[in-house]
Interface confidence: low
């Protein structure tokens, strides 16, 4: 509700109004809690007095505000209670149905999951949702069909299509496909993107790097993100949780923020880390009404009431002008249990028994000042960056504590807020932005950008220098040509054009004309000013020495033709001929070639064999085969020279080794013995005791070592044993007890041993018996 | 995913001249630096230089005299020569992509500098 | 002797947290991104940090960088055996107009 003239003496606004100009005219604008010109009158919708979804009206009635009830479709009565005959009256919605009244004979029914109809009286075969995967419900004769999206098939929808079964195939440039429920992805070769690999992947474009990162090619299908403070990922797609380790206390939940976090503080407690009790009745200047007195308590607040209201907030009144006091000439109005001081110009307080404090506006501006309707001082309610009684004190945010200014920035004070000045290479209004400095592309000429703190790095390609690399290093500054020679600048080179007579890559070298080898054939080049000459090669001529001497005029070749070399000739000689001059005949016969004996006769580059009788050929290099009738019996056949020769087998003999040799012919058996001839050999049958193939030698019994402490002696069919001292028996087995003939004298006392015996002797005697 | 592989000879003689070759595979040889890095036991991990795709190249100061480099992207080849080599050039020779940080690595192939 | 210094050897048991160093110069740390890489026996090296704190895809989240001046660290949490390997730090340095190493350090897992 508004009123005139609110700024005029004596028309202010009451309980929290504010006086605000509308239309050229002036007017208060209540709070909730009050109406009226002057938002004097308590709001009696406040209390909901109209029922049945009535809405409740604010009226004027003589002054004094009222209200009046405007109901809902189907009620009336003051305050809706009086049902009206209509079409909901009789229920007509079943199975728990809610009827809403179009008009008093029309309704429609607003029908509990499972039911449908005009009265709910259908079952819904689409109560249940049986269509999964965002499918469409439509209920067909008693039961449902399911229309599904794209990506779904079957009777309820829960088949997944299969896209990547489709042909050709959804993901291009070599892409490969991944079925997913309800959709499909896509995984793209390095060298394309998009949702079907359709697009080439140009690194940074578009940029992948999130929340503000820069982007920086490192490849053909490669890149890199700088991040800004507080993110983290290849992509800073990952905000740093900065809540690791913080510092909410009183049951704060620490909430993450971009590069820090902030607490989110139960009701009781306020400040940056829930430290400091919340002050109810300063953060709330109404939180007890009607001029209650607010005590701040730990976790709340208490109000004490003003006579004549009560309750929590003090929004109860109790009081009435029948027992009212209105101080100084204040009107007293007449309320439902209750009254009001209506306070002339300058008053204020329930009573009116106080000054208005806020008249002689006390607050600085910008500020809202509200009388203490207790003791009518000034409360002033300060802006943002302002603070003491009268808001007119400034304050420090830079003293607070932490510095607001992020990355070292120097925070400065300003009436009502602050401003941070930022170190190079950061910027915002807190500093919380890093300056990639490198963004510009600053370096030129293919240099790399190294983004640094408030600063840039290029890297030059080589033959560029500057900040920017935007110099072509002048590699012509140190006058490198010599000789006046003209110096031209390149990338990371220089070039000399030289004067004449001058050359090399600093025109350092006087022009030699023997330089471009003039003189041939190896001639020696004598250099001379601006000239040369040339000592020619031995058989060369000429200016250039390029005239090669005729060393075949006159032919010196005397059988064979000429061909002219360098200071030299060479003769191809006519067959049968050699020497440097072809003046020799060559005497083939000189190499022997005819064979077996044949005689050579020399010819002209020829010669002739004479060969002997059975061999044959130019070089009498075949001997005929005497061999080839086999005239050798039981032997190989060697062919000589006119004739052969019969080499026999063992056993046979005779030009022809047809005659067996008979072994026996000799006696070769001694000792009686009888021999038996064979071929290429005999066998002896010897005697009894003989043995051998002559039987010359009778059987050595002693070959078996018989004697085992003795030595051995052969004899015919036998052997004789003579053994070693102490021992005895036919093999010399028998150790002999030397000391049983008692030879230990003298009462020495005797020990057998394995060859012979020992005595120990007694005092006074020695020797080997103790003789 | 790009490869690298390294070749070249195993065994050079003192002030003889150091030729290696490394292949790419896998990927594109432009808009790419092309490094070259040693690691000795005495003096540990040493950057020898780059050569960019375009052919530019830049190399250690104090090797500066005694490198050159090359591509040739139609081979997709890197190659790298050192001069007048001494015992101290005895080491595990790598190529990889990249100026400033590497990635990915040759597996590095072994020189050894002796008569 | 190496332009970056760092630590011949660190060790810590499984599912432990070490930290490597890497002190260096305002040529070379101080005003130019810092790398890290891995290198397991018989291995090349392998780029594991790099601009200072951001990964390669691929590289477990385990391991993370940091800068500050003129010294950069290398952090790894929750060890594992088969994070034995020598680590080295690598920058440009302005001064000497090349990339410059560190000399490496061992980390062992006991």
């Known amino acids: 509700a508004r009123g005139p003239r609110c700024s005029q003496p004596g028309e202010t606004c009451l309980n929290g109004g504010k006086c605000e100009a509308a239309n050229g005219t002036e007017a208060c604008v209540c709070g909730g809690a009050f109406v009226g010109p002057r938002c004097q009158d308590p709001n009696p919708c406040l209390s909901t007095p109209c029922k049945n979804a009535g809405t409740c009206h604010v009226v004027d009635r003589r002054g004094v505000a009222d209200y009046a009830c405007s109901c809902a479709l189907g009620f009336s009565g003051p305050l809706c209670l009086t049902p009206l005959d209509n079409a909901c009256l009789t229920n007509p919605c079943r199975n728990g149905g809610t009827c809403d009244l179009l008009t008093l004979t029309e309704y429609k029914c607003r029908c509990p999951p499972g039911w449908s109809g005009k009265s709910c009286q259908q079952a819904d075969p689409c109560a249940s949702n049986p269509c999964a995967n965002g499918g469409q419900c439509l209920p067909f004769e008693a039961s449902y069909i399911c229309h599904c999206p794209p990506s779904f098939h079957g009777p309820t929808c829960r088949q997944d299509v299969n896209e990547c079964g489709q042909k050709p195939g959804l993901c291009r440039h070599g892409g490969t496909c991944h079925n997913e429920v309800g959709s499909y992805r896509c995984v793209c070769r390095a060298t394309h993107t998009g949702p079907n690999c359709e697009r080439p992947y140009v690194p940074c474009s578009p940029s992948p790097c999130q929340n503000g990162g820069t982007c920086r090619p490192t490849g053909d299908v490669t890149h890199e993100c700088a991040c800004l403070p507080g993110f983290t990922g290849q992509n800073c797609e990952e905000n740093i949780d900065d809540c690791p380790g913080n510092n909410c206390k009183n049951g704060g939940a620490c909430v993450d923020g971009v590069n820090t976090y902030n607490c989110r503080c139960p009701p009781e407690w306020t400040g940056q880390y829930c430290t400091e009790d919340v002050d109810e009745c300063q953060l709330m200047p109404n939180a007890c009404q009607n001029g209650g007195t607010c005590h701040n308590t730990h976790g709340g607040y208490n109000c004490v009431c003003v006579n004549g209201w009560t309750g929590e907030d003090c929004s109860e009144n109790i009081d009435d002008c029948a027992s009212a006091a209105c101080f100084h000439g204040a009107t007293c109005h007449d309320r439902v249990a209750s009254f009001y001081c209506e306070c002339p110009h300058g008053r204020t307080g329930l009573l009116c028994h106080l000054n208005d404090a806020c008249i002689s506006n006390p607050c600085n501006e910008g500020s809202n000042c509200d009388t203490n309707p207790v003791n009518g001082k000034a409360i002033c309610t300060c802006p943002s960056g302002y603070t003491g009684p009268a808001c007119s004190q400034d304050v420090d945010e830079c003293s607070l504590g932490a510095n607001p200014c992020e990355h070292a920035g120097k925070c400065i004070n300003t009436l009502g807020s602050f401003e941070c000045q930022c170190l190079q290479g950061y910027t915002g209004p807190r500093c919380e932005i890093d300056v990639n400095e490198c963004v510009s592309n600053p370096c030129q000429n293919d240099a790399t950008c190294l983004d640094q703190i408030g600063e840039f790095q290029c890297i030059c390609m080589p033959g560029y220098e500057g900040v920017h690399c935007e110099v072509n290093t002048d590699e012509c500054a140190s006058s490198p040509c010599l000789h006046n020679g003209r110096c031209l600048d390149k990338i990371n080179e220089f070039q000399c054009e030289c004067p004449t007579g001058f050359t090399g890559h600093l025109c350092q070298y006087d022009v030699d004309e023997c330089a471009s080898t003039p003189c041939k054939n190896g001639a020696k080049c004598l250099d001379g000013p601006n000239t040369y000459t040339c000592v020619c090669t031995e058989g060369y001529t000429g200016t250039h020495c390029e005239v090669d001497i005729d060393e075949c005029d006159p032919d010196p070749c005397h059988y064979g033709s000429c061909k002219d070399g360098v200071a030299t000739f060479t003769c191809l000689c006519r067959p049968g001929y050699t020497g440097h001059h072809c003046e020799t005949n060559i005497n083939e016969c000189s190499s022997q070639p005819c064979r077996h004996g044949g005689t050579c006769q020399d010819r002209d580059n020829a010669y002739l064999c004479f060969c002997l009788k059975g061999t044959t050929g130019p070089n009498c290099e075949i001997n005929l085969d005497d061999c080839a009738s086999s005239p050798c019996d039981s032997g190989t056949c060697l062919d000589k020279i006119d004739g052969y020769e019969c080499a026999c087998e063992p056993g046979y003999t005779g030009s022809m080794c047809n005659i067996n040799i008979d072994e026996c012919a000799g006696n070769p058996c001694h000792n009686g013995g009888t021999c038996e001839d064979g071929i290429n050999g005999f066998t002896c049958r010897c005697p009894e005791g003989y043995h051998d193939p002559t039987c010359l030698s009778e059987v050595n019994e002693c070959n078996s070592n018989p004697c085992v402490h003795g030595a051995c002696r052969d004899s015919l069919n036998g052997y004789k044993c003579d053994c070693d001292p102490g021992w005895s028996g036919t093999n010399c087995d028998i150790n002999n007890n030397e000391c049983e003939s008692n030879p230990c004298v003298n009462g020495g006392t005797c020990k057998d041993m394995t060859s012979g015996y020992v005595c120990t002797c007694r005092e006074g005697f020695s020797g080997p018996n103790c003789q | 995913e790009v490869q690298l592989v390294e070749s070249g000879p195993g065994l050079v003689k003192p002030s003889e001249t150091l030729s290696l070759t490394c292949t790419v595979s896998?990927?594109?040889?432009?808009?790419?630096?092309w490094s070259w890095i040693r690691q000795t036991p005495g003096k540990g991990l040493e950057w020898i230089g780059y050569?960019?795709?375009?052919?530019?190249?830049n190399s250690n100061p104090s090797l500066k005299s005694r490198v050159t480099m090359s591509v040739d992207t139609s081979k997709n080849q890197v190659s790298l020569t050192l001069s007048s080599v001494t015992a101290a050039d005895t080491a595990i020779y790598y190529c990889?992509?990249?100026?400033?940080?590497?990635?990915?690595w040759g597996r590095g192939t072994m020189v050894t500098v002796s008569s | 002797q190496s332009v970056l210094t760092q630590p011949p050897s660190v060790s810590g048991a499984p599912r432990q947290r070490v930290t490597i160093s890497c002190s260096g110069s305002?040529?070379?740390?101080?005003?130019?991104?810092v790398n890290w890489y891995q290198q397991l026996p018989g291995e090349a090296p392998k780029l594991l940090i790099y601009?200072?704190?951001l990964l390669p895809s691929g590289v477990s989240d385990r391991f993370s960088g940091s800068k500050s001046g003129t010294s950069a660290s290398l952090a790894i949490s929750g060890l594992q055996s088969g994070d034995e390997a020598d680590y080295y730090c690598?920058?440009?340095?302005?001064?000497?107009?090349?990339?410059?190493f560190g000399g490496g350090t061992k980390l062992t897992v006991l």
């Open positions: 990889a992509r990249g100026n400033g940080w590497y990635l990915p």
């Open positions: 896998g990927g594109s040889m432009t808009s790419n630096f």
């Open positions: 050569v960019l795709y375009t052919g530019s190249t």
């Open positions: 305002s040529s070379n740390i101080e005003n130019n991104i």
């Open positions: 601009y200072d704190n």
């Open positions: 690598a920058a440009w340095d302005d001064s000497l107009k090349a990339v410059v």
